[in-house]
């Protein structure tokens, strides 16, 4: 069953800067992604951005930058101008649509601050990032090597002395990173008994998507929702690569050849999806 994960991050350096990451785990081609806040698409939410795999992105304040991270995940940077930092208690929702198969939506938010006395942004959670861990590890090896060389030199010049132990400084990078449980509401087109899955996703994002894809805002019209079921098993994002097999779109900025005065057809360059025509009236 396809699932959607949502992760909300707060920058440690800029507490007013937030990033929402969303990803789609499952088969099928993504035709549109809608990001909203304050609730799901069509249930009181306010749209922040829409991303289309080929046609581009559209965004609305306070969204700062929406982009594709991979073929199956997106990120949205938000700038919180208000002093009260409303993002800290806001729910962000992502809907992945695959027309006409169905759509799946999940929501997540920053977890509440561990200190009840704190009012606005939650305390950043210390997380040792992989790149810093590598640097620290390398530094440790170098320090140890230098210390050992000094030890050997001293042994040659003087009588053996007790072995020196190099002191290591251990630092951690602060990144406020909340992996929010995301409730995926699957709206399968012909399946009125679709399931809703709750899952957690670790912070793995694959290679960046070429040239930022785009999407559009629309009236929210949903397929029937099904009963909810929850699970606590972590879902890994890496390796769950979903190719966008939509033959009806062209790359942003390119105009495909017209097969008629107003009907535009697109070569099926991304997979078995059949070629589709776009509206031809201008």
């Amino acid at each position: 069953t396809p699932e959607v994960w949502v992760q909300v991050q707060m920058e440690a350096t800029e507490l007013s800067s937030f990033t929402v990451h969303c990803g789609f785990l499952g088969p099928g081609s993504i035709s549109l992604v809608t990001v909203s806040w304050g609730g799901p698409d069509g249930a009181g939410g306010t749209k922040l951005a829409v991303l289309h795999p080929e046609l581009g992105t559209r965004q609305w304040a306070p969204a700062r930058q929406a982009r594709w991270e991979t073929q199956s995940s997106i990120s949205l940077a938000l700038e919180d101008s208000g002093a009260s930092s409303p993002f800290a208690n806001t729910t962000f929702c992502c809907k992945f649509a695959s027309f006409p198969e169905g759509s799946w939506e999940s929501c997540g938010s920053l977890p509440p601050s561990s200190d009840p006395g704190l009012s606005a942004p939650p305390t950043p959670v210390p997380i040792l990032r992989a790149d810093l861990a590598g640097i620290l590890g390398l530094s440790g090896v170098l320090l140890f090597g230098c210390g050992y060389l000094l030890h050997l030199l001293r042994r040659q010049k003087h009588r053996p002395t007790p072995r020196l132990q190099p002191s290591h400084t251990n630092s951690q990078a602060l990144t406020a990173q909340a992996w929010a449980p995301s409730q995926a509401s699957q709206a399968a087109l012909h399946d009125p008994y679709a399931t809703i899955n709750t899952s957690f996703c670790p912070a793995t994002l694959d290679t960046a998507h070429p040239n930022g894809w785009a999407s559009l805002p629309t009236h929210a019209a949903h397929q029937p929702q099904g009963p909810a079921a929850s699970a606590s098993t972590p879902i890994l994002a890496r390796g769950s690569f979903v190719s966008v097999e939509n033959g009806l779109y062209t790359q942003a900025g390119e105009r495909p050849p017209h097969t008629g005065p107003g009907l535009t057809l697109f070569p099926d360059c991304r997979g078995p999806r059949a070629v589709e025509g776009r509206f031809g009236v201008r």
């Epitope: 069509g42 046609l55 649509a97 999407s215 559009l216 629309t218 776009r278 509206f279």
Partner: nanobody, 121 residues
Framework: EVQLVESGGGLVQPGGSLRLSCAAS????????MGWFRQAPGKGLEGVAH???????RYVDSVKGRFTISQDHAKNSLYLQMNSLRAEDTAVYYC???????????????WGQGTMVTVSS
């Protein structure tokens, strides 16, 4: 809960007419466009017609002059009047609500379950 419900499909002879209806409910987002897509048996999806937020209708070439798209804002409904139907119009027709990335295309964000239109003698 957002819902788009199509109706009006059925079997019709070549040259005949049908009127498809789409009742929309539950959405809160502002939208760019509403329209109709279709998928013929064994074929890909095709945008048939859509109406922009400014009320301008747009059609694919193959239906120009035969199909008319219209809206009733009071009823939150969308219609597709199909005249001079041909065998090649046989398809499942989907009502969609979507976003515009360019003037020619209404990218579906939500859609109904579809209604079958069969044109056959």
């Amino acid at each position: 809960e957002v819902q788009l419900v199509e109706s009006g499909g059925g079997l019709v002879q070549p040259g005949g007419s049908l009127r498809l209806s789409c009742a929309a409910s539950g959405y809160t987002f502002s939208t760019d466009c509403m329209g109709w897509f279709r998928q013929a048996p064994g074929k890909g999806l095709e945008g048939v017609a859509h109406i922009d937020s400014d009320g301008i209708p747009r059609y694919v070439d193959s239906v120009k002059g035969r199909f008319t798209i219209s809206q009733d804002h009071a009823k939150n409904s969308l219609y597709l009047q199909m005249n001079s139907l041909r065998a090649e119009d046989t398809a499942v027709y989907y009502c969609v609500v979507g976003f515009k990335f360019d003037e020619d295309y209404c990218a579906p964000n939500d859609w109904g379950q579809g209604t079958m239109v069969t044109v056959s003698s």
